[in-house]
Interface confidence: medium
């Protein structure tokens, strides 16, 4: 047997040089780096490059899809609904998040080579858009709930209120992502690639717990409960009423909740297990650590994938988006005006009642 008998000068050094667990999307509790990573990771080189390919594909799809969504909404100024405004912000959030993916992809291969300033900025951008994206999904579900269940138009007709809600979401997202801006920096360690993670020095464990619980509650549990409540009652109303658009609305609503769950539930369940382990609620072992790290890597990809699926769910399923896109192409002479559908209207989110969209 080949013996790499590399004797360490001190027992602290003995633990140094272990690969760091990949830092996870929206996860604000860093790996235990203060004394050096103690477990041998079970990582395969192929995984690293597979993740980079996925990031690149999501980047391209998200860039294309969200740009088209924004383009169609911005072009349809006349009949723009409240949901359109939320979708515009959602597309912007997903687009901004997608713009950070090439940097994260590069860091998967080489470690964090971009310095502390970019570490803070890119991390902030990533977190802000994670929060705003999920919170906007919740707002869209509330808007549908008010429009279909309560047939409320007065509240959402007030454009300034919708703008205020959107600004509040961005503001709240910025607030929730503030710890990232304050604590995240490039950390250099002997024999280990530099990493971009939260360094809180000797701050209390309570701080760390708070920083882990925030994304799990605000980023998933609260929006999920809002969505389930709103879409549950919306579907019930659609079943009772005899609306012409009922089946299409149901299809889109089902797709929204299903894709949201498929993308975020696995990651958040693994994150919960990770939190329980890090807080010693369940005993941490190297084997469990490795299993959870691998699961975080895999489920993180699903979460990231959600940003490029939004245009497909919210827009491409709805025929109004296609009509809107065709209209833009016709305006620019890229297709014949004869090929436009007769009922093509500027708003792409579906049949609208005043300023409130009822379906996608």
């Amino acid at each position: 047997m080949e013996d790499f008998n590399m004797e360490s000068d001190s027992f602290e050094d003995f633990w140094k040089g272990e690969d760091l667990s990949n830092y996870s999307y929206s996860s604000t509790l860093p790996p235990f780096l203060l004394d050096a990573a103690p477990c041998e990771p079970e990582s395969l080189e192929i995984n690293k490059y597979f993740v980079v390919i996925i990031y690149a594909l999501v980047f391209l799809l998200s860039l294309l899809g969200n740009s088209l969504v924004m383009l169609v909404i911005l072009y349809s100024r006349v009949g723009r609904s409240v949901t359109d405004v939320y979708l515009l912000n959602l597309a912007l959030a997903d687009l901004l998040f997608a713009l950070t993916l090439p940097i994260w992809a590069a860091s998967k291969v080489n470690g964090w080579i971009f310095g502390t300033f970019l570490c803070k900025v890119v991390s902030l951008l990533k977190e802000v858009n994670f929060y705003s994206g999920i919170l906007l999904l919740a707002c869209i579900s509330v808007d549908r709930y008010l429009a279909i269940v309560h047939a409320t138009r007065t509240l959402t007709q007030k454009r300034y209120l919708v703008k205020f809600i959107c600004l509040s979401i961005w503001g709240l997202s910025l607030l929730l992502a503030l710890p990232v801006l304050l604590f995240r920096r490039t950390v250099y360690s002997s024999n280990v690639s530099p990493a971009c993670y939260e360094d809180m020095g000797n701050n209390t464990a309570n701080w760390r717990m708070l920083l882990r619980i925030l994304p799990q509650s605000f980023g998933f549990i609260v929006p999920l409960l809002i969505m389930l409540f709103c879409y549950g009652f919306t579907l019930r109303t659609l079943f009772k009423a005899h609306m012409g658009q009922k089946h299409r609305a149901m299809r889109v609503i089902f797709a929204v909740v299903l894709i949201f769950l498929l993308c975020w539930l696995p990651y958040n369940l693994v994150l919960l297990a990770d939190t329980l382990m890090r807080t010693q609620v369940i005993q941490e072992t190297c084997e469990r650590r490795n299993h959870i790290d691998r699961a975080l890597d895999a489920t993180e990809i699903l979460g990231i994938l959600h940003s490029c699926l939004n245009p497909l769910i919210y827009a491409f399923i709805g025929q109004k988006f296609r009509h809107g896109l065709l209209k833009i192409l016709a305006i620019h002479g890229l297709i014949s005006k004869d090929s436009l559908p007769k009922d093509s209207r500027p708003s792409f989110v579906g049949s609208s009642s005043g300023h409130t969209s009822t379906t996608l």
């Epitope: 360490s8 027992f11 050096a36 477990c39 041998e40 941490e284 072992t285 190297c286 490795n290």
Partner: antibody
């Protein structure tokens, strides 16, 4: 179930050599740092040496440096301790143990073998 | 000489509470753990990371730490708890054990 089974102990003359083995099962061997701990008859526990999961890093107690060599074969899930220039004071039960080290400041032995007795006597 | 100091022996009546202490500079910034060793047997981990109890260890075993002193508490001590107890931590020179404490249940 985690199992650690030591072998290779026995009677050896002062100045002699001995190689202890520890066959591991029930866990992903290469994920764990492993260690040897010894206990002289009627005495307390004394840590001997540790080796990282990859094998690319070893550490020894001061009194063992230069005489003992820890190694591992991850393909065989086996840990080794080669002991040279043995002295009477090395007489002890040698335990193979799985070193849990899940936070920077906490390292402990979750699982122990049954031990193998090494007697150094002329 | 051991870098973690333990009393050589502690005696307790059945049903009473036994406290075994362990002191050392390394405990100021490192976790302590405790092992129970019965005659002719291998050590068994009873407390790790100062206060945590592995699965299978009775609830009567608990750990605490204040400054550089860690304490193993056995409440409602039973005859079967009679054994040697060792504390353990680590420092820049490696893993360190206490000298051990013989717990006698009277």
């Amino acid at each position: 179930e985690v199992q650690l089974l030591e072998s290779g102990g026995g009677l050896v003359q002062p100045g002699g050599s001995l190689r202890l083995s520890c066959a591991a099962s029930g866990f992903t061997f290469s994920s764990y740092a492993m260690s040897w701990v010894r206990q002289a008859p009627g005495r307390g526990l004394e840590w001997v040496s540790a080796i990282r999961g990859s094998g690319a890093g070893t550490y020894y107690a001061d009194s063992m440096k230069g005489r003992f060599t820890i190694s591992r074969d991850n393909s065989k899930d086996t840990l080794y301790l080669l002991m040279n220039s043995l002295r009477a004071e090395d007489t002890a039960v040698y335990y193979c143990s799985k070193l849990e080290a899940v936070s920077g400041t906490g390292k402990y032995f979750q699982h122990w073998g049954q031990g193998t007795l090494v007697t150094v006597s002329s | 000489s051991y870098e973690l100091t333990q009393p050589p022996s502690v005696s307790v009546s059945p049903g009473q509470t036994a406290n075994i202490t362990c002191s050392g500079d390394t405990l100021g910034d490192k976790f302590a753990c405790w092992y129970q060793q019965k005659p002719g047997q291998s050590p068994v981990l009873v407390i790790y990371q100062d206060t945590k109890r592995p699965s299978g260890i009775p609830e009567r075993f608990s750990g605490s730490k204040s400054g550089i002193t860690a304490t193993l508490t056995i409440s409602g001590t039973q005859a079967m708890d009679e054994a040697d107890f060792y504390c353990q931590a680590w420092n820049s020179r490696g893993v360190v054990f206490g000298g051990g404490t013989r717990l006698t249940v009277l």
